[in-house]
């Protein structure tokens, strides 16, 4: 008799996920030699311990601590860039500008980055079939724990000046929701963090509106200046010529607003 | 090879402060976390917390908040600890730990006596 | 915070005898689970982490195994120079907690 399972209303945990989870690891250990220490079959063994055998509507960040400690990693705190809902131009960025880092540059968001988790209740399998979705389901699931718990911690690491990378196209181009607005916002440190520049990424070529006037960007800034950090905008109108400009500074046209 | 040494034995007034050091060497200190614990004469091991030198960050056992406050300065990497309002009590033996960022105590200092008497 | 009960307190044992000493944890803590020896008047050493794995230069007459909440420690073939207090340590939450200690002599 088959046993029941639950059945959740987002994707099951994503196909070979401890195969991939260890794999990564152990490429980026050796590409970054400040982390070859990292003994990565410990760290699959406390990211697997976090939420095997565990409901998974009933994680803990306390869960994930044995996987925080064994992942530590200390990036340049000047050099940090968040992101809200335009990941890709993020990465790209960094891959380009090296001295800067993403969260998923770092070892515990390398290894995270695009998968889906969870375990059963009081059984040692990982559930392929469905996961808990965060709005309908559970915002306590393993996925949504984890990346709170790692947004935090970065957020909490940060300093002097902190960049984000925010969405134009978007209708709430910062969103109190986001992971940006809702967990890192909070968590950067007013006593080391001298600034948020956020950079607005316009969507349409021909789109040439100050979005630093957005209403949702005032609201962020209202949020930042009451945690007395100073707060600035940049419209970034031409993403594609700004990647460009990043890779060659010394280009003519780099000189002009992009 | 890691080596954590630390500062000589002290013997301080109920009431006094003290502050003890623990030089890192063999590795990249601001990598990695210190551990400090405290072991009073003939009894057990009681983890007080830890610093992680690059970014400062801390985590104390909720016993030991307002008596430990925990530092570190990166640039002759070396940890401190200093305890406050001492009393009988704090007399014992403090040992840092580290390196590794692991789960367990790897290497040790080799433990600094504290002694509280009028 | 995660209470570790080691047992017994204290043992004595023969020269060549193998002794188990226990450690339980309150909650389960996976396998976060090393144990130390303490020899008088010096400093803890590692001798296991992560439940059963030996530390770099421990002999192998040093085992441990266990996880979730049950853990044991064994020495077979006792010498005399295993003559210490062995303490248990979980690494699964903050505060990290210890045992309260085995000490061990020989009869």
């Known amino acids: 008799v088959p046993r029941w399972r639950q059945q959740w209303s987002g994707p099951g945990t994503t196909k070979r996920f401890p195969e991939t989870v260890l794999a990564r690891c152990v490429k980026y250990t050796e590409i970054h030699p400040e982390m070859r220490h990292v003994d990565c079959q410990s760290v699959w063994d406390a990211f697997k311990g976090a939420f095997i055998s565990k409901h998974p509507c009933n994680i803990t960040e306390e869960d994930y601590q044995p996987l925080m400690k064994l992942g530590t990693q200390t990036v340049p705190c000047n050099k940090i860039l968040l992101w809200s809902r335009i990941k890709d131009l993020a990465h790209q960025f960094t891959q380009v500008q090296r001295d800067m880092f993403t969260l998923e540059d770092t070892l515990l968001g390398y290894l995270a980055d695009d998968l889906t988790w969870c375990g059963e209740f009081n059984t040692s399998k990982i559930n392929y079939q469905s996961c808990p979705d965060w709005r309908k389901d559970c915002s306590n699931n393993p996925v949504s724990v984890f990346w709170k718990t790692v947004s935090r911690r970065f957020a909490e690491a940060a300093c002097d000046v902190v960049h984000v990378m925010l969405n134009g196209s978007r209708s709430k181009i910062f969103d109190k929701n986001s992971t940006f607005g809702s967990v890192e916002v909070h968590n950067l440190q007013p006593e080391k963090v001298q600034t948020l520049e956020a950079w607005v990424i316009h969507g349409g070529r021909e789109d040439s509106r100050d979005l630093c006037q957005d209403p949702t960007i005032k609201e962020l800034e209202s949020i930042i200046s009451k945690r007395n950090i100073q707060f600035s905008c940049k419209n970034i109108y031409r993403p594609d010529k700004f990647l460009q400009c990043v890779k060659n500074p010394e280009d003519s046209s780099c000189t002009s607003e992009i | 090879q890691v080596q954590l040494q630390q500062s000589g034995a002290e013997l301080v007034k109920p009431g006094a402060s003290v502050k003890i050091s623990c030089k890192a060497s063999g590795y990249t200190f601001s990598n990695y976390w210190i551990e400090w614990v405290k072991q009073r004469p003939g009894l057990g091991l009681e983890w007080i917390g830890d610093i992680l030198p690059g970014s400062g960050t801390t985590n104390y056992n909720e016993k030991f908040k307002g008596k430990a406050t925990f530092t570190a300065d990166t640039s002759s990497n070396t940890a401190y600890m200093q305890l406050s309002s001492l009393t009988s009590e704090d007399s014992a033996v403090y040992y840092c730990?580290?390196?590794?960022?692991?789960?367990?105590?790897?290497?040790w200092g080799q433990g600094t006596l504290v002694t509280v008497s009028a | 915070d995660i209470q570790m009960n080691q047992s017994p307190s204290s043992l004595s044992a023969s020269l060549g005898d193998t002794i188990t000493i226990t450690c339980h944890a309150s909650q389960n803590i996976n396998v976060w689970l090393s144990w130390y020896q303490q020899k008088p008047g010096n400093i803890p050493k590692l001798l296991i982490y992560?439940?059963?794995n030996l530390h770099t230069g421990v002999p192998s007459r040093f085992s441990g195994s266990g996880s979730g909440t049950g853990f044991t420690l064994t020495i077979s073939s006792l010498q005399p120079e295993d003559i210490a207090t062995y303490y248990c340590?979980?690494?699964?939450?903050?505060?990290?907690?210890f045992g309260g200690g085995t000490k061990l002599e020989i009869k």
């Open positions: 992560k439940a059963s």
């Open positions: 340590q979980q690494g699964q939450s903050y505060p990290y907690t």
């Open positions: 730990a580290g390196y590794g960022n692991y789960l367990w105590f790897t290497y």
